[in-house]
């Protein structure tokens, strides 16, 4: 059974590709799923020789390897687009890169913004 | 080279009890979930139980509720069924498998044959 | 309870395209129940093919494919090859921590 998870409402929104897909750039945004399935936030960004590029972040449905998930970590050694999902409200404000193979722990801290909420 | 290694199986009574383990190398076991699959003789794979990366959370197929229990030491890198009240319908071989995002078992052990017979 | 279904056995020629399909008792399967599917051999581990309806795992030939064809989950095969000759599962996550396997389908390739 699922025990004390914490539960998803809202997430931080980010699209780097928000022209293209006709959508808002950044702001917060509301989770909605199937009742009786937890929700997630996510993050996912490049890596370009140290300089961080975000591609997304938002709202992700119920995904078993994402359950009981503080913090949003990535392990994948060197992918193309780095990912992470975590539980609880804006828990991918923050976002941290851990390699499997113990390498240096990098945590990347947003910009202070105003975001604005996404229905 | 990710690797899982099953362990414990045996023959046992029925109404005995038995600890498999599983234990991992290869990735970051603490920050992946994991689960138990069985294979009855002859039939298809069924999905037995599963326990997020703190083990805060677990679940279990219908028919093993209440007389398994799954359990995990990240300290260990090890995955644990405990399986009591075993019938001669949990015959089967057991794996354990690694699950990835997007909810799919990416790793898979050999499996270990779990036989209840007297 | 949830039940999933795939066709029991299937044959292909050499070289000829099978589709494998995988649906369920309540509904219409989508992306969110991440479907993936495996490949066994007897006496084998299973091997995993596709997840997420439609990615190829890593070191997959590109001759398996995923789909949704109309309210099921899908498996093709292009070009089928003797050593394509197994068992094929499907998987649905339904939430909540529950996957729940198809009954499988034994191919073979004559």
């Known amino acids: 059974s699922g025990r004390g998870e914490a539960e998803t409402r809202e997430c931080i929104y980010y699209n780097a590709n928000w022209e293209l897909e006709r959508t808002n750039q950044s702001g917060l945004e509301r989770c909605e799923g199937e009742q009786d399935k937890r929700l997630h936030c996510y993050a996912s960004w490049r890596n370009s020789s140290g300089t961080i590029e975000l591609v997304k972040k938002g709202c992700w449905l119920d995904d078993f390897n994402c359950y009981d998930r503080q913090e949003c970590v990535a392990t994948e050694e060197n992918p193309q687009v780095y990912f992470c999902c975590c539980e609880g409200n804006f828990c991918n404000e923050r976002f941290t890169h851990l390699p499997e193979a113990g390498g240096p722990e990098v945590t990347y801290e947003p910009p202070p913004t105003a975001p604005t909420l996404l229905t | 080279e990710v690797q899982l290694l099953e362990s414990g199986g045996g023959l046992v009574q029925p109404g005995g009890s038995l600890r498999l383990s599983c234990a991992a190398s290869g990735f970051t076991f603490r920050n992946s979930a994991m689960s138990w699959v069985r294979q009855a003789p002859g039939k298809g794979l069924e999905w037995v139980s599963s326990?997020?990366?703190?083990?805060?959370?677990?679940y279990y197929t219908d028919s093993v509720k209440g007389r398994f229990t799954v359990s995990r030491d990240n300290s260990r890198n090890t995955l644990y069924l405990q399986m009591n009240s075993l019938r001669a319908e949990d015959t089967a071989v057991y794996y354990c498998?690694?699950?990835?995002?997007?909810?799919?078992?990416?790793?898979w052990g050999q499996g270990t044959l779990v036989t209840v017979s007297s | 309870q949830t039940v999933v279904t795939q066709e029991p056995s299937f044959s292909v020629s050499p070289g000829g395209t099978v589709t494998l399909t995988c649906g369920f008792n309540?509904?219409?399967?989508?992306?969110?129940?991440?479907p993936s599917w495996y490949q066994q051999t007897p006496g084998q581990a299973p091997r995993t093919l596709i997840y997420n309806t439609n990615t190829r795992s890593s070191g997959v030939p590109d001759r398996f494919s995923g789909s949704i064809l109309g309210n099921k989950a899908a498996l093709t095969i292009t070009g089928a090859q003797a050593d394509d000759e197994s068992d094929y599962y499907c998987?649905?996550?339904?939430?909540?921590?529950?996957?729940?396997f198809g009954g499988g389908t034994k191919l073979t390739v004559l």
């Open positions: 309540s509904g219409s399967v989508s992306t969110s129940y991440y």
């Open positions: 998987v649905l996550y339904m939430g909540s921590g529950i996957h729940v």
């Open positions: 498998a690694k699950v990835y995002y997007y909810s799919f078992f990416d790793y």
């Open positions: 326990i997020s990366v703190t083990g805060g959370s677990t």
